[in-house]
């Protein structure tokens, strides 16, 4: 194994793959179809599986990014100069072990995912060999948002990003020079990975609701 600067194993296997090395959404791979004895997934299990599936997709995309540019060697200080306003978990969001608040946290997760959507749109034309996986990550995130919205009681607290603002942000990002576009791609992937991991930790904390079926993978 060789590692990129962010501590990821660059050649680790991606779960939910078919023989062509493409991501297969949870519930659509042959293992899921060919197991009539299995209990249907609960909503919590489905959300857990969906997040893990997206994280596997991000891992594949980061692999391509790190292989074709040296962005993965950039320190966080250098990356911080890029003033993207990417969603990030903080103590006040109620998603950490200390100060955990299920409702506040769920609102933060959904709001954050909605804010990431414009950045996921930006990623769509940024990959050559992993184009389908970039699309799979984007579409799976939309599905994840729908799953989570069904779970949330306080939907009024969720603010949806302004489409006009998103459109101008997208135009601005796409107008950057090549180096900045590579940097932006790397930053988005790293931040999205961190946000999803924070979310998954929190969701597993929610009364320890989520338990994965024995043969769900």
């Amino acid at each position: 194994d060789y590692k990129d600067h962010d501590g990821d194993y660059k050649d680790h296997d991606i779960d939910y793959k078919d023989d062509d090395d493409k991501l297969v959404p949870p519930g659509e791979d042959s293992k899921d179809v060919a197991a009539p004895h299995r209990q249907p997934l609960t909503s919590s299990e489905r959300i857990d599986k969906q997040i893990r599936y997206i994280l596997d997709g991000i891992s594949a995309l980061r692999k391509e990014t790190c292989n074709k540019s040296n962005m993965c060697e950039s320190s966080k200080e250098a990356l911080a100069e890029n003033n993207l306003n990417l969603p990030k978990m903080a103590e006040k969001d109620g998603c950490f072990q200390s100060g955990f608040n299920e409702e506040t946290c769920l609102v933060k997760i959904i709001t954050g995912l909605l804010e990431f959507e414009v950045y996921l749109e930006y990623l769509q034309n940024r990959f050559e060999s992993s184009e389908e996986q970039a699309r799979a990550v984007q579409m799976s995130t939309k599905v994840l948002i729908q799953f989570l919205q069904k779970k949330a009681k306080n939907l009024d607290a969720i603010t949806t990003p302004d489409p006009t603002t998103n459109a101008s942000l997208l135009t601005k990002l796409q107008a950057q020079n090549q180096w900045l576009q590579d940097m932006t791609t790397h930053l988005i992937l790293r931040s999205f990975k961190e946000f999803l991991q924070s979310s998954l930790r929190a969701l597993r904390q929610m009364g320890d609701l989520i338990s994965v079926p024995v043969d769900s993978r």
């Epitope: 590692k3 950490f96 991991q197 930790r201 904390q205």
Partner: antibody, heavy 121, light 110 residues
């Protein structure tokens, strides 16, 4: 070469406090998840807690409230604050670097040599 | 509260033996399990993660299998340097747990 070096261990009286440090060289610490693990003499590994890149900390039930993990990425250093120490906290304390794919599946792929904390009057 | 139970606690074996250590989780943890080797006076060393993925530099005589609640570490042909203590570590949930590690299995020379 990547290295983790713990320091700050020693003899402390019951009820006392201690701050352990783990200095990391050869990598940018901010990109990694980190953990403290302890091992009492002749016993097995006991997880103390994690600190993730999102700055969240997660502790073992028995460590909550008494132990605090923090990091200073600018100094490439991980810390463990030990309070209200008891005789049963006597152990070698290891810091370890981790990589996480999903949530808590933090594989600890690089460890320090450990620092011994002895709690005794 | 997820608990890991390793068995056996002690195992006497000879060089060349096939050795199997099991780790049982109190609830399903998918494949989110790692195995470590520790020699006396030394820090633990990561052997396997995601239940079956071998860490770089670890000999192929080590293998891991399992998913859900039952996991196995197998050493196909025990070598003199393999006499050590082995620990499993769950990575499914670290909230409301006392320990993420199993109790350990000491592999001794017969």
């Amino acid at each position: 070469e990547v290295q983790l070096v713990e320091s700050g261990g020693g003899l402390v009286q019951p009820g006392g406090s201690l701050r352990l440090s783990c200095t990391v060289s050869g990598i940018d610490l901010s990109s990694y998840d980190l953990s403290w693990v302890r091992q009492a003499p002749g016993k097995g590994l006991e997880w103390v807690g994690y600190i993730y890149t999102d700055s969240s900390t997660w502790y073992a039930n028995w460590a909550k409230g008494r132990f605090t993990i923090s990091r200073d990425n600018s100094k490439n250093t991980l810390y463990l604050q030990l309070n209200s120490l008891r005789a049963e906290d006597t152990a070698v304390y290891y810091c370890a670097r981790g990589s996480t794919d999903y949530a808590f599946d933090t594989r600890l792929d690089l460890w320090g040599q450990g620092t011994l904390v002895t709690v005794s009057s | 509260d997820i608990q890991l139970t390793q068995s056996p606690s002690f195992l006497s074996a000879s060089v060349g033996d096939r050795v199997t250590i099991t780790c049982q989780a109190s609830q399903s943890i998918s494949n989110e399990l790692s195995w470590y080797q520790q020699k006396p006076g030394k820090a633990p060393k990561l052997l396997i993660y995601r239940a079956s993925t071998l860490t770089s530099g670890v000999p192929s005589r080590f293998s891991g299998s399992g998913s859900g609640t039952e996991f196995t570490l197998t050493i196909s042909s025990l070598q003199p340097e393999d006499f050590a203590t082995y620990y499993c570590q769950q990575g499914y949930n670290s909230n409301d747990v006392d320990n993420v590690f199993g109790g350990g299995t000491k592999v001794e020379i017969k």
